[in-house]
């Protein structure tokens, strides 16, 4: 393990870089458990989750830390200094291992780059002068005592600070004992800064801000250079206006934040324009919370805070964490600079899902004849882990054969108000596919998620539905089994039809016309509608093989094309049993077993002929009860 | 709204490849759905010769597809069009467009 | 392929005449096609999308209607501006097709 720095005064996760543990087994980071045995000593360590509680961490996994969530707070101690070391001391377990001691070493330091402490300096707090006025700057506003803290205690009284001023003020004067600093005498000491002697005096003349740059280092005895740290950095002086004036609130952007997470409230969220108010004097009150949440102080104990300052606010004190409802909320806030009447503010807080998913509940169907459908709520709908939000959707992977279109235009992004308006529809462009699909990314309140959506073609097919067929029969293929009339007139053309799989048993056939008309039948892989209505197709239905003689089950898969329109696929399911003498059946049969022609006394052979044999039941189909049509598709 | 520019050179040989570019500017070409490009014979009717969608895929009309390749530059904003061995009779002026806007159009001469 | 049709190929009006062109596909485009407006020289415009919705900036002159096969663009009162080719293109089925023109001009 590395050594954790840390800035003074701030709070830093634990990383992967300064704590990390393996095992030879590839252990699973949930796994690996550490368990703090002595807690460090300038600080406290956290859970990003758990910060309120204020209770000491225990234990944390290998996992947290790689999430960040793991945090080591610096509490500022009263007396100043440059460098302090702290140390960490933890078990790793990960049964069945043995356990092993690891200590992590801290180092807090003024030398680091600190975006959330841009002075080197123990205090560089800037001043507030009112307009052509004086002011002293006291080692409460600026104060170099750290870096004589980094010189042994014993040699300290030797030491100073020289502030050497690189630019001067613009707007003022500084004096020390009451003599002007000038490009000539550019030095003060932290002597005289401790002993009071410093003052800004400003010229008067307007409220712009002021301000000086100044580089410190430490001076050793006699006024000589010594090495050791030093910085240079700008003092801002904020100049007042004597007469008092209202604060002016600014807009606020809203907070977003994940259920269960924690975000410090900025400038965007609550700021005020003051001239004459420093941030420490704008206070805050909260008049109604949400329930989605609630406040909180870096270092300011358990629970919800109340009142805060603008103070608390700039330098990142302030922050929320979205323990409630995974609702938007509204912070009603009263804020006064001590001398208005307070101002009602309010901070919205946006709870966002901390995942969504893209729902699929059924691939789009297009209807054959009209090549397009509205997408639905059925193909695309977000869900997270709050009420439904208003999904916008990007295609990341267009269809192959057709196009997505809101209006009548092509378009690639469109939003869940326009899917459940029935204004986004798919459109084949290529006919010459039964189906397509295609990727969106759906995008809601912040998060991602992308889904495929699938497309079929719904034939527009009317197919028998009715009682079984006879075994070793060949029935009459015609539009009372198949019939793709409609589609031939909403196209104006002749559909055609190929099959793609099936009977199991048994074979689709093209008899001839006549008894006159020569050979047998022959093997049909395609036909068209017209090939139907002729008459000119039957259906030999087989026995299945091996097994007994009884009730069967088989069915053909066909492909539908027509001028215009896309394929579609569609299924003829049929039962088979036995053939029965007896029984009327309700398609046209060709041909009948030949056992049951021999058991009638007419051995005849079984090619099938252009009218129905001789012990065909049923010359002309009969409808069946309850009807052997049923309508595949309503347009 | 979207703007379409052609460029590329206004004379070409025979038997060689005709390459012009389309820079898009006012809309991204991985955003509007298609970019096509259209050609117009002098004093004739306008034919669509093929689009790239903004996930980059192509089609092409049947009767050029052999000759023709459109291919996209995200980082430039760009789409090209390429025209394998030309004759005289893909003399035209060539335009770039999107569902609504058209470049407004560069003659192409084949000519030795 | 579709083929487009346009009739009439040309045709002479004044300024505030009626003017109405037909587009014929050979089946049904479902709707999805386009009217275009090309001056000489120039590239042409879109006017017309989806049968019906006029594209933003286009004077309300223009109008579209028609289903299946049969499609008619018309201008309510001829302008000076207006006399130009007219151009259908549908977007039902690939390869997009245009109809031949038609030409209008002052009589």
């Known amino acids: 393990s590395q050594t954790l720095t840390v800035c003074p005064g701030s709070v830093q996760p634990l990383s992967s870089q300064t704590l990390r543990a393996s095992s030879s087994a590839g252990t699973d980071p949930q796994l690996l458990l550490y368990r703090v045995v002595r807690g460090p000593q300038l600080g406290r360590l956290f859970h990003a989750q758990q910060d309120s509680t204020g209770e000491a961490l225990v234990n944390f996994t290998q996992a947290e830390v790689y999430a960040g969530n793991i945090l080591y707070e610096h509490e500022m101690p009263p007396e100043p200094f440059w460098e302090a070391h702290d140390t960490l001391e933890l078990q790793l377990s990960s049964p069945p291992a043995r356990d092993v001691a690891a200590t992590l070493a801290v180092a807090v330091s003024f030398e680091a780059a600190c975006p959330q402490r841009p002075s080197h300096l123990w205090k560089n707090k800037g001043l507030w002068v009112p307009e052509g006025q004086r002011a002293r700057i006291t080692v409460a506003a600026l104060d170099a005592s750290n870096l004589l803290a980094s010189v042994p205690s014993p040699q300290r009284s030797e030491h100073d600070v020289l502030f050497q001023v690189t630019q001067f003020p613009s707007r003022g004067q500084l004096l020390v004992s009451e003599e002007p600093l000038h490009a000539g005498q550019p030095h003060f000491l932290q002597s005289q800064l401790a002993a009071g002697q410093l003052v800004y005096a400003h010229g008067g003349g307007g409220t712009q801000q002021d301000g000086f740059h100044f580089r410190a280092h430490l001076q050793g005895p006699a006024g000589a250079s010594v090495a050791g740290p030093q910085t240079s950095e700008a003092f801002a002086i904020t100049v007042r206006d004597v007469n008092e004036r209202p604060p002016q609130p600014q807009a606020s952007v809203p907070l977003r934040l994940t259920r269960g997470s924690r975000a410090p409230i900025s400038r965007a969220q609550l700021s005020v324009v003051d001239p004459d108010s420093a941030p420490g004097e704008i206070e805050y009150e909260v008049q109604r919370a949400p329930h989605n949440g609630f406040l909180s102080l870096v270092g300011g104990g358990l629970g919800p805070v109340t009142r805060f300052t603008q103070a608390d606010v700039d330098s990142g004190r302030l922050a929320f964490v979205a323990n409630g409802s995974s609702v938007a909320g509204i912070f009603q806030l009263s804020m006064s600079d001590g001398a208005s009447p307070p101002l009602p503010m309010s901070l919205a807080v946006d709870i966002l899902p901390s995942a969504i998913e893209v729902q699929l509940r059924a691939p789009l169907e297009v209807p054959q004849a009209l090549g397009r459908s509205s997408l639905s709520q059925q193909q695309l709908r977000v869900v997270s882990d709050r009420e439904e939000p208003e999904a916008a959707y990007r295609l990341i992977q267009g269809p192959q054969y057709g196009h997505l279109l809101v209006g009548g235009r092509p378009t690639s992004a469109f939003s869940q108000f326009q899917i459940d308006q029935g204004e986004v529809v798919f459109a084949f462009t290529n006919f010459s596919s039964s189906h397509d699909h295609f990727r969106v990314l759906a995008l809601a309140r912040g998060v991602n998620a992308s889904a495929v959506v699938n497309v079929t073609v719904r034939a527009l097919l009317h197919v028998w539905a009715g009682g079984p067929w006879p075994q070793g029969a060949t029935l009459r293929l015609d539009p009372t089994v198949l019939d793709a009339g409609e589609l031939a007139n909403r196209t104006g053309s002749v559909p055609r039809f190929r099959l793609l799989e099936g009977p199991r048993h048994g074979r689709v056939v093209r008899v001839p016309r006549a008894r006159t008309e020569p050979g047998g039948s022959q093997l049909v892989e395609q036909f068209t509608q017209q090939d139907l209505e002729d008459g000119r197709l039957g259906l030999e239905v087989g026995r299945p093989e091996g097994r007994a003689p009884g009730p069967a089950g088989d069915s053909l898969t066909l492909e539908l094309w027509a001028q215009g329109v896309p394929p579609a696929v569609a299924s003829l399911d049929f039962a088979t049993e036995p053939y029965n003498a007896a029984r009327p059946y309700s398609v046209a049969l060709l041909s009948v077993p030949e056992a049951a022609r021999t058991e009638a006394g007419k051995p005849e052979s079984s090619t099938p002929t252009g009218e129905p044999g001789p012990m065909a039941s049923s010359p002309e189909p009969a409808v069946a009860k309850g009807g052997f049509l049923s309508f595949l598709e309503a347009n | 709204q979207v703007q379409l520019q052609e460029s590329g050179p206004g004379l070409v040989k025979p038997s060689q490849t005709l390459s012009l570019t389309c820079t898009v500017s006012g809309g991204s070409i991985t955003s509007g759905y298609y970019w096509n490009w259209i050609r117009q014979h002098p004093g004739k009717g306008l034919e669509w010769i093929g689009y790239i969608t903004y996930d980059g895929s192509n089609n092409y009309n049947p009767s050029l597809k052999s000759r023709v390749t459109i291919s996209r530059d995200t980082s430039k904003n760009q789409f090209s069009l390429k025209l394998s061995s030309v004759t005289a009779a893909d003399t035209a002026v060539y335009y770039c467009a999107d569902f609504d806007y058209w470049g407004q159009g560069t003659l192409v001469t084949v000519s030795s | 392929d579709i083929q487009m049709t346009q009739s009439p190929s040309s045709l002479s009006a004044s300024v505030g005449d009626r003017v109405t062109i037909t587009c014929r596909a050979s089946?049904?485009?479902?709707?999805?096609l386009n009217w275009y407006q090309q001056k000489p020289g120039k590239a042409p415009k879109l006017l017309i999308y989806?049968?019906?919705s006029l594209h933003s900036g286009v004077p309300s002159r223009f109008s579209g209607s028609g289903s299946g096969t049969d499609f008619t663009l018309t201008i309510s009162s001829l302008q000076p501006e207006d006399f130009a080719t007219y151009h259908c293109?549908?977007?039902?089925?690939?390869?997009?097709?245009f109809g031949q023109g038609t030409k209008v001009e002052i009589k």
């Open positions: 293109q549908q977007y039902s089925a690939l390869p997009w097709t």
């Open positions: 089946y049904g485009i479902r709707g999805y």
């Open positions: 989806y049968t019906s």
